[in-house]
């Protein structure tokens, strides 16, 4: 979890004096607790934007938004603290909205928005706007918390973000697997235009069953410059065992930018249809 | 013009099965997570399952886990809602949602975040 270009970041607006502090997400308020303490906010929103880097990469990021109840606690309203927390690793980050002025009630809904959380690809968070101070131990929760999961990098839109792309998401590799005589698979797929090795990872499956029966590693040589976007085609042997028909072709990419932690794309291939077979008709009528 | 049309709705009596469609159009059906919510006579609006842009990631309201499932199918811009064993309670005016941005609320309070735009179709489960 990080920031966006930590260049100078602004929560201040009309009638309003504020500025966006580091947070260590233990704010003051909860050690030394206030009498008066603000309600929680309302409306909080969590979208999924794009920002770029003043280096130009396009970054997913957390857009918060969140309005102010219209009640008098405003008065006592000192500023948020906002964290994200990445709920698989536990990994949290907080900023800290301190108010420089004190709040008025005026014609509009206050209303505060950041946009400066990067989230990853194909992760959950859960985001949580406090408002301070904190309440005291048995104060009513002045806090909203809502959950929010991130599209991974097959998304059309994530796809041309810049950890997406880093990771290859713009190489579709268009697999097409089609089952040969003599208990043969061949593989076809488009290179991407990059000298780097691939690697075929082939498991087989019985039919209905996900254990598998039988597994090979297929290793593909760089290609050379001519050869970038062409087809490269793979004949690999399986193993005779009846019934060790479902098999999932994985190809494994090696670019630079990912090294071993490239997008895998897959193609599967389903055991042929049984034909229904009749039942056997008894040459001899039981006498029961 | 984002458009949701659901269909499916009917009179059922309980324990019986029902399976609500919703079409769409109008954008990128294919990068949103859709939802589905209700509401009951007299009763607020209430989230009652979600599912993200490629079908990766469902959630279901405590009350109707294990009866209903919601699927979808990007190629045909449509969003389905099986319910199994219903209930009184499941009597209902059920909403197709678009989820706003392009992630994914995957917690129970998320329907101020969806876009509602149809009639609904109503779910009556009566004796």
């Known amino acids: 979890l990080r920031l966006l270009d930590h260049r100078a970041l602004v929560c201040s607006q009309p009638g309003l004096n504020c500025t966006v502090k580091n947070s260590t997400c233990l704010d003051d308020s909860w050690i030394h607790p206030r009498n008066l303490t603000p309600s929680s906010p309302k409306d909080l929103q969590i979208q999924l934007h794009f920002a770029h880097t003043q280096q130009g990469d396009l970054f997913p990021v957390a857009h918060i938004e969140w309005t102010l109840q219209t009640d008098a606690s405003i008065l006592y309203l000192e500023g948020a603290e906002l964290s994200v927390l990445q709920l698989n690793t536990n990994e949290r980050l907080c900023v800290r909205f301190e108010f420089l002025s004190k709040l008025r009630h005026h014609h509009r809904r206050w209303r505060f928005t950041f946009s400066h959380f990067v989230v990853d690809p194909d992760q959950e968070y859960e985001v949580t706007v406090h408002h301070l101070p904190k309440p005291i131990p048995d104060g009513d929760p002045n806090h909203q918390s809502k959950n929010f999961l991130v599209p991974d990098c097959e998304h059309a839109r994530m796809k041309v973000t810049t950890p997406c792309m880093s990771s290859g998401s713009l190489w579709d590799p268009n697999i097409t697997v089609e089952t040969l005589e003599a208990h043969q698979l061949r593989v076809s797929f488009t290179l991407w235009n990059e000298s780097t090795h691939y690697q075929i990872l082939l498991t087989s499956f019985p039919h209905m069953e996900n254990h598998s029966c039988f597994e090979h590693m297929h290793h593909i040589p760089a290609p050379r410059p001519e050869e970038f976007h062409q087809r490269s085609n793979v004949t690999l042997t399986l193993r005779n065992l009846k019934g060790c028909c479902r098999h999932q072709v994985q190809i494994q990419p090696f670019f630079s930018s990912c090294l071993n932690d490239c997008l895998r794309h897959s193609a599967t291939v389903s055991c042929p249809e049984m034909p229904d077979t009749p039942e056997p008709i008894p040459d001899y009528m039981p006498l029961w | 013009e984002v458009q949701l049309v659901e269909s499916g709705g009917g009179l059922v009596q309980p324990g019986r099965s029902l399976r609500l469609s919703c079409a769409a159009s109008?954008?990128?059906?294919?990068?949103?997570?859709m939802h589905w919510v209700r509401q009951a006579p007299g009763k607020g609006l209430e989230w009652v399952s979600g599912?993200?842009?490629?079908?990766?990631?469902?959630g279901y309201a405590e009350p109707v886990k294990g009866r209903f499932t919601i699927s979808r199918d990007n190629a045909k811009n449509s969003l389905y809602l099986q319910m199994n064993s219903l209930r009184v309670e499941d009597t209902a005016l059920y909403y197709c949602?678009?989820?706003?941005?392009?992630?994914?609320?995957?917690?129970?309070?998320?329907?101020?975040?969806?876009?509602?735009w149809d009639q609904g179709t109503l779910v009556t489960v009566s004796s």
């Open positions: 109008g954008f990128n059906f294919d990068e949103y997570a």
């Open positions: 949602a678009k989820e706003r941005s392009l992630g994914y609320c995957s917690g129970g309070s998320c329907s101020d975040g969806f876009d509602i």
């Open positions: 599912i993200s842009w490629n079908g990766g990631r469902v």
